[in-house]
């Protein structure tokens, strides 16, 4: 058979035909359609959108499109008993209350079912007490407060600014510090870019704008009541007291107008340094409590949200592969939004929709991919990646045997400066080669490749002439596929200039002002960045599903493994005396990485030389590539995080959004100088080095000649 057995068009023409079919105007139209009303997880509106997408994907030509439903724990404000925060005087009278809703944007004044700002999964409670300002509520912020400033947060309500780390980590840190409540706010220093107007006149956050979001610490568990298993109709559910990852103290988010009112009265200690000061006209005093004149006033939280088991719906579309139907390439992104979802997620969902339409067009012309492509519209991502995780739990046996790759498709844009890619090292070469073939949409790069503009604007800090590609962390739907199942994964979107815009995320993230108009007026009027992201995501899926030999380069894993080994070793070497005392050696890890490198090199040579017309040998080599990511999975998982099983990468224990390399060793070394039993602590470091070395060696052996 020819190498082109899956199609009636030449392979080069296929990719071109697929890319040429993608149209910016369609993405624009789909975005508009998806953003006219809220699509909150668990609501009727989001169920209707699921059915609409199911119907349209069928029309586009997919072989089958099914809804997969689960009954999971969600969280909603009480409609008749709103959440708010007060300043109370010594008599208990409320002398200031935070706003109950965001002022709706122009044109949306009459839209119903806009959920007011809340912290999803906050327990109910009405704590009152003195305020302590804890900066970003990062691990290092609490170290500064407790160890250096000797400020005790126990029994206090803490106020933390959004940004830098995942909000769930902030809440966990506050709980561990003994706080009895958390107020989260958006500081203009992080959510108001200088020289840009507030929405609706620009893309900055107005003072009444508030970031919603969940505050769970699930560590990959999915539905809090059914960890490890799908929340189906015969599921056994834990009691709420045993649920995974729920916060134990009330939490509520506010905008910077309201934050000003709380922070301007703060007394106690001055901020330790300028990094603790935001951009409000307040002293940023740490507290505890208010200054002199206001010292008898307290802060009181009123939180009445409820946790409810609610039905959610994923849409799963299938385009059957012609040659290897039992090999799955998955493109997935979520559909649920906090409000209108102008960027998150619908800028991604619109791109997925157009990718499905393009693949469907090719299929109607008689083409099929070599491998099966699965398309997914996930539900309840905003509530803890629930839809994707439950589906993966339900289908884990199929996925671990058949899953080739997962490409994530949440927000297509978080800026309009350059490309941003996070992926497994196996995909580095795929991404490089693809972006060299795509045109850059950037001003000043007309006629140049996307690779060129990306490399110029976002150069790799380590490798000359290469663009930056980051580690996968979490906070999105690839988590279960990569961190739990070990399926090669990647994500791509257009981003801001991190050099000049140091605010966190994009200013209107998870606010009511994330509308279609935000995108159409300010971010991407021509939808050229959306189109580029569609080309990157779609192009990756196309290559992964259609190339004869999987487009994975195991040599790139070898390079990063050595880099990560050097990094973790240098962290450990900050304690040379203890390393001597406890006989801590990284030699086993260094040796395993070198073995991996040599075996990967030999495998790559065989990959270039083998007879690709022999289907058995081809399948054998492709299986070795497909299962390499799987080989980095430790079935026992990481300490206290059983669903994070990848030994090379995990979400940082201090920031779910960030990826950490050799996380087991990293966590064992973290703050080791403060451990009460150094012998035990260094013993755990040694154990983690052993686990890492064994895993790398075992992974290397999967690439060895089979006999």
């Amino acid at each position: 058979k020819s190498s082109n057995e899956a199609t009636n068009i030449t392979p080069k023409h296929n990719m071109k035909a697929f890319l040429d079919e993608l149209k910016a105007e369609n993405i624009k139209k789909f975005l508009y359609n998806f953003t006219q009303i809220p699509h909150l997880a668990g609501t009727e509106q989001n169920f209707q959108l699921a059915k609409q997408i199911q119907s349209q994907w069928k029309e586009f030509g997919l072989d089958s499109v099914e809804l997969a439903h689960y009954d999971v724990l969600l969280s909603y404000p009480n409609k008749t008993h709103p959440n708010y925060i007060s300043i109370i005087n010594e008599d208990g009278n409320e002398i200031f209350n935070t706003s109950l809703f965001e002022p709706p944007p122009p044109g949306y004044e009459n839209v119903s079912d806009i959920v007011p700002p809340f912290s999803a999964f906050s327990p109910q409670g009405m704590p009152e007490g003195d305020l302590v300002y804890v900066n970003y509520a990062r691990t290092e912020d609490f170290f500064k407060l407790e160890r250096d400033m000797k400020i005790n947060c126990s029994g206090k309500i803490v106020i933390a600014r959004y940004g830098k780390v995942f909000r769930g980590n902030k809440v966990k840190n506050a709980q561990l510090a003994g706080a009895k409540g958390v107020i989260l706010y958006s500081d203009p220093a992080d959510y108001f870019a200088p020289g840009v107007k507030s929405y609706p006149d620009g893309w900055n956050l107005p003072g009444g704008g508030v970031q919603r979001g969940n505050i769970l610490n699930l560590n990959g568990a999915g539905d809090p009541l059914t960890p490890g298993y799908p929340a189906n109709e015969y599921a056994y559910r834990r009691g709420i007291a045993e649920a995974v990852g729920l916060p134990s103290i009330p939490v509520h988010p506010i905008g910077y107008y309201d934050a000003q009112k709380l922070l301007e009265k703060m007394g106690g200690s001055a901020p330790p340094d300028s990094s603790w000061r935001g951009s409000l006209k307040v002293p940023y005093n740490v507290g505890p409590g208010f200054t002199g004149n206001f010292s008898t006033q307290k802060v009181k939280m009123h939180i009445h949200s409820t946790n409810e088991v609610t039905r959610i719906y994923n849409v799963i579309g299938t385009l059957r592969g012609a040659v290897e139907p039992d090999r799955y390439v998955i493109l997935g992104g979520h559909r649920d939004s906090w409000v209108f979802g102008g960027i998150d997620p619908q800028s991604g969902a619109a791109v997925v929709h157009e990718i499905v339409r393009s693949f469907g067009t090719l299929k109607k012309e008689g083409w099929r991919p070599r491998r099966t492509i699965l398309f997914a519209s996930w539900d309840a991502e905003e509530f803890g990646l629930l839809g994707s995780t439950e589906w993966a739990e339900e289908n884990s046996r199929l996925l671990q045997e058949r899953g080739v790759a997962y490409i994530n498709a949440d927000s297509s844009i978080e800026g309009n400066y350059t490309l941003r890619v996070d992926c497994t090292p196996l995909m580095y070469s795929l991404v490089h080669n693809l972006t060299k073939e795509l045109k850059s949409p950037d001003e000043g790069f007309e006629g140049k490749s996307l690779y060129e503009s990306w490399t110029k604007k976002s150069p790799s800090p380590e490798f000359s002439g290469m663009p930056r590609i980051s580690k996968l962390g979490s906070g999105n739907d690839f988590e279960v596929f990569f961190q739990r199942l070990g399926i090669a994964s990647g994500r791509a979107r257009y981003t801001k200039n991190w050099e000049t815009n140091k605010f966190s995320g994009y200013p209107l993230y998870h606010s009511v002002y994330e509308t279609y108009e935000l995108v159409e007026k300010f971010y991407d009027p021509m939808f050229k960045y959306h189109l580029t992201v569609a080309q990157v995501r779609g192009g990756m899926v196309f290559e992964l599903a259609n190339s004869i030999v999987l487009p994975f380069d195991c040599r790139d894993y070898a390079v990063v493994l050595r880099k990560y080994a050097d990094k973790i070793y240098s962290i450990s070497m900050k304690h040379p005396q203890e390393m001597k005392t406890y006989s801590v050696s990284f030699d086993s890890l260094f040796s395993a990485v070198k073995n991996f490198t040599e075996i990967a090199s030999k495998f790559s040579e065989r990959l270039q030389d083998f007879d690709k017309s022999n289907p058995i040998v081809l399948r054998m080599m492709n299986d070795q590539l497909m299962f390499l990511e799987r080989a980095f999975i430790d079935p026992l998982g990481l300490p206290d995080r059983p669903f994070y099983r990848h030994v090379i990468y995990a979400p940082s224990s201090h920031n779910k959004y960030a990826g950490e390399s050799f996380p087991g060793i990293y966590d064992a070394l973290f703050d080791i100088e403060s451990k009460v039993d150094p012998s035990k602590a260094w013993g755990e470091v040694k154990r983690q080095i052993y686990v890492a070395a064994f895993t790398v060696q075992a992974a290397a052996e999967t690439l060895s000649e089979v006999a």
Epitope: E462, Y569, M573, P576, F586, K594, T597
Partner: antibody
Framework: EVQLVESGGGLVKPGGSLRLSCAAS????????MNWVRQAPGKGLEWVSS????????YYADSVKGRFTISRDSAKNSLYLQMNSLRAEDTAVYYC???????????????WGQGTTVTVSS | QSVLTQPPSVSGAPGQRVTISCTGS?????????VHWYQQVPGTVPKLLIY???NRPSGVPDRFSGSKSGTSASLAITGLQAEDETVYYC???????????FGGGTKLTVL
């Protein structure tokens, strides 16, 4: 016979440019990391730059970063070093050297060219 | 000032055994990076003598041997001969510099 032959050296003024070439034969050039190493008169060996087999991983010594560019053409079995903004301290014999594998940080350099002399002087 | 430290010179009588040391740090030899040794006769091209700490390329006499322990490595030459009188370099990789590093070279004199 495994062989590396450098060319392109010469006398150049400070601030000037030169392009060195290295022709490889007798081995599968496309499978190995390649390097440039230099030796100033009466001094020791100094690594300058490395490039891996598919030109994706490129590294430079701090002393030449931003001024020198390494490249290769596997179809022509050739390695290049474009040297810009040359300084007097770049005066040296420049050797092209093959790494024993595709990872410059692990392996020794088993094949060396005869060297080409670069003199930077006004 | 080289990252890898070698003695500027060593000497020995014909037939004797000499060792040349190469001292690194926790970022190169101590970080699991191998050491390689080269011989360079003045006016000629460097020649690989020992690779991966202790391996000899074909054609190198077994009088030459290498070893590495921790942050130090050494090249031993037994049965010293007149033609061994030349310069020897050690080489490794330094992760803090992200680059290949050479020792300053050691001149061996056969007395």
């Amino acid at each position: 016979e495994v062989q590396l032959v450098e060319s392109g050296g010469g006398l150049v003024k400070p601030g000037g440019s030169l392009r060195l070439s290295c022709a490889a034969s007798g081995f599968t050039f496309s499978r190995y990391n390649m390097n440039w190493v230099r030796q100033a008169p009466g001094k020791g060996l100094e690594w300058v730059s490395s490039i891996n087999s598919n030109s994706r991983y490129i590294y430079y010594a701090d002393s030449v970063k931003g001024r020198f560019t390494i490249s290769r053409d596997s179809a022509k079995n050739s390695l290049y070093l474009q040297m810009n903004s040359l300084r007097a301290e770049d005066t040296a014999v420049y050797y092209c050297a093959k790494t024993m594998g595709d990872y410059y940080y692990y392996y020794g350099m088993d094949v060396w060219g005869q060297g080409t002399t670069v003199t930077v002087s006004s | 000032q080289s990252v890898l430290t070698q003695p500027p010179s060593v000497s020995g009588a014909p037939g004797q055994r000499v060792t040349i040391s190469c001292t690194g740090s926790s970022f190169n030899l101590g970080a699991g990076y191998d050491v390689h040794w080269y011989q360079q006769v003045p006016g000629t091209v460097p020649k690989l003598l020992i690779y991966d700490n202790s391996n000899r390329p074909s054609g190198v006499p077994d009088r030459f041997s290498g070893s590495k322990s921790g942050t130090s490595a050494s090249l031993a030459i037994t049965g010293l001969q007149a033609e061994d009188e030349t310069v020897y370099y050690c080489q490794s990789y330094d992760s803090s510099l992200s680059g290949v590093v050479f020792g300053g070279g050691t001149k061996l004199t056969v007395l």
